[in-house]
């Protein structure tokens, strides 16, 4: 008789990433009997919630339930009903909510409270909604990519499972770019981490890791743009801002009240003799780059070396995975190839930014104008941040790998967060056991 497959003995987990610009729901799946193995958890679904980030619901919290409905219903469909009650659901909010909490702890708490009540209405095992720290965001991103790359596995493999996998067990650094913050996380080479706030110690699968991490609040791509606009409008002679970070011919009216609606622009706030101003794009990469550099204070460093704003940064070491908006932006610009040098990226950015807005709109007719208009800024910002902010060079650029997915799972903090909260990353190396009986019939 033919062998019949037994019912899959699998488990599921759900993590919602409540970012500054949007919320995404991720569903993960793994074989129940292999929980402690490295690399067995994989993503089976991503659902992007329609609408803005949850912090934007502060004046309309009653709309949060409806906002989350579609993706939660999708999770209901994807996960077998028999598994619903034992499927954990976690929501982690990042820098958008950190910024709201800076304004008011109560406001942030009210938003989270409504989120919790909404998520509790589903048949899953809801485990809570919280604002994760920037340190956690960096750490979990680092765990995610190294878990997916197989870096925690003690077995040396003669084959490579992913394009950028070197056969050694050297971990990858993690570079994460969001809308409101950016994180840099890596294991420095025999370097003392001079500031305790930036030091993490992990024991994973029997090995100790001393990890450096920092999250730069207000230096995600959206908040960096608000900062740049607030800085540049200070010196504008009238209500026209000729902006090198937007394509020639691009025009957009900005409300001054919107400009100052974030704690990130506080340092540039001033009284302007107008309520609105118009951005007029002039599309000049070099000038855009120069304007962006003014957001990084490199004049002060109380350590042996710094990134910017007086934040300690050890010498860069090893390969880095650059994900989230680092990847999305560079992918749009067609600059994610391993073969593209930093000089070539800069050249292509110069050409892209100089292209007239009308031409750009025609070439990318399917892309929303709001996003399309900001790729020149975002690409230039990524280069500025990596080169001047984090001190990558033309030579070390080749160590940056722009990663969207690894083995079908999105690179980002959510997988690492779930692995940690479900205790699926043991401190010690699990004893290798024979294949369980359920594997074959």
């Amino acid at each position: 008789t033919q062998n019949k497959a037994l019912p899959e003995n699998v488990k599921y987990g759900i993590v919602l990433d409540a970012g500054s610009s949007h919320t995404s729901l991720y569903i993960y799946k793994w074989p129940a009997e292999k929980e402690n193995d490295t690399g067995v958890v994989h993503q089976v679904e991503e659902c992007r919630v329609k609408g803005p980030g949850i912090s934007k619901f502060v004046q309309k919290v009653n709309e949060i339930g409806i906002y989350l409905t579609d993706c939660m219903e999708r999770a209901r469909e994807v996960i077998p009903r028999s598994q619903h009650q034992e499927t954990p659901v976690y929501l982690g909010a990042t820098a958008g909510m950190r910024l709201l909490r800076m304004e008011s702890e109560e406001l942030a708490d009210r938003v989270l409270d409504v989120v919790e009540r909404s998520l509790s209405n589903y048949p899953f095992d809801f485990q809570g909604a919280r604002i994760i720290t920037g340190q956690e965001e960096g750490a979990y991103g680092w765990i995610t990519i190294n878990y997916l790359l197989g870096k925690f596995s003690q077995k040396t493999r003669w084959f490579s499972i992913v394009p950028y996998e070197t056969n050694n067990q050297e971990t990858f650094g993690a570079l994460d770019l969001g809308g409101a913050s950016t994180q840099v996380t890596f294991v420095p080479q025999n370097q003392t981490i001079e500031s305790p706030d930036n030091a993490l110690q992990f024991r994973l699968y029997g090995k100790d890791y001393n990890v450096y991490t920092h999250s730069f609040l207000c230096y995600g791509k959206d908040q960096a743009l608000w900062q740049k606009l607030a800085k540049d409008i200070q010196v504008a002679s009238n209500e026209i801002l000729r902006d090198p970070c937007f394509h020639p011919g691009y025009k957009k009216v900005v409300n001054v009240s919107d400009l100052y609606k974030t704690p990130c622009t506080k340092r540039f706030e001033m009284t302007l003799p107008f309520q609105q101003f118009e951005i007029q794009g002039i599309g000049n990469y070099q000038q855009c780059h120069q304007s962006i550099l003014e957001l990084f204070n490199t004049s002060y460093c109380p350590y042996s070396q710094c990134a910017f704003n007086g934040i300690f940064l050890p010498p860069l070491q090893g390969d880095f995975g650059a994900f989230s908006a680092f990847y999305f932006v560079m992918k749009f610009l067609n600059l994610t190839s391993e073969k593209v040098s930093q000089e070539k990226v800069t050249e292509m950015m110069k050409k892209f930014c100089a292209q007239p807005w009308e031409e750009i709109k025609t070439s990318y007719a399917g892309v929303k104008e709001k996003y399309l208009s900001e790729y020149c800024f975002s690409g230039t910002y990524i280069l500025s941040l990596l080169l001047q902010g984090y001190h990558f060079t033309a030579d070390s650029w080749e160590h940056i790998h722009f990663i969207g997915k690894i083995q079908g799972s999105d690179a980002g903090w959510t997988l690492g967060y779930m692995l940690n909260l479900t205790n699926m990353i043991p401190a010690e190396q699990p004893l290798s056991t024979p294949l369980s009986h359920s594997t074959y019939v």
């Epitope: 004046q59 800076m102 304004e103 008011s104 109560e106 708490d109 009240s257 506080k266 706030e269």
Partner: antibody, heavy 123, light 106 residues
């Protein structure tokens, strides 16, 4: 030291308008949420309106919604309350009050108060 | 709106004694409860924020406790300058105050 000084109060007829001002000093004004709280003669305290530090959240008590408008001018370190369609029940001392902080986070409690300005609505 | 009910309306206590003032919220307000003191002709003064934190410059004889719906302000040993009206205020929803407790000399 932190100082909040209200002005603009007075006697006004029902249905008319009045604008109150609160001049702030001794702190970085744009880093703090600001509020108006009132107290009718011989009565308790009643919150009127709030304006968070980055204007993310602007809110009003139901009793004044649609009639009063809170605003701020960070360059002048001044908070305003534009009151229109005034009623007899709006008669009160109006206090300007600053939001407090829980460590690095803003809080919706009131850590500093001005001395108040009296508004009397009477025909 | 969240209704705050203070009790008692008036409390008569002798100097040196302990005074306990209560405040009940009509719904849970977590620990977002704050206490103020007001003397005649003066603006209110913050005493306690977030249920149990002593405001700057306030003597240690003042303390606060509670969470959810039930909160207490305690003055361990009354001084003559403590006779005043005390208000509680919640900030979990848009701010609302209790009607006040008048602390008077017995």
């Amino acid at each position: 030291q932190v100082q909040l000084v209200e002005s603009g109060g007075g006697v006004v007829q029902p249905g008319r308008s009045l604008r109150l001002s609160c001049a702030a000093s001794g702190f970085t004004f744009n880093n703090y949420g600001m509020n108006w709280v009132r107290q009718a003669p011989g009565k308790g305290l009643e919150w009127v309106a709030s304006f968070s530090s980055s204007s993310t959240y602007i809110s009003y008590a139901d009793t004044v919604k649609g009639r009063f408008t809170i605003s701020r001018d960070n360059s002048k370190n001044t908070l305003y309350l534009q009151m229109s369609s005034l009623r007899a029940e709006d008669t009160a001392v109006y206090y300007c009050a600053r939001h407090g902080r829980y460590g690095g986070y803003g809080g919706f409690y009131f850590d500093y108060w001005g001395q108040g300005t009296m508004v009397t609505v009477s025909s | 709106e969240t209704v705050m009910t203070q009790s008692p309306a008036t409390l008569s206590v002798s100097p040196g004694e302990r005074a306990t003032l209560s405040c009940r919220a009509s719904e849970g307000v977590k620990s977002y409860m704050h206490w103020y003191q007001q003397k005649p002709g003066q603006a209110p003064r913050l005493l306690i924020y977030k249920a149990s934190n002593l405001a700057s410059g306030i003597p240690a004889r003042f303390s606060g406790s509670g969470s959810g719906t039930e909160f207490t302000l305690t003055i361990s040993s009354l001084q003559s300058e403590d006779f005043a009206v005390y208000y509680c205020q919640q900030s979990w929803n848009d701010p609302t105050f209790g009607q006040g407790t008048k602390l008077e000399l017995k």
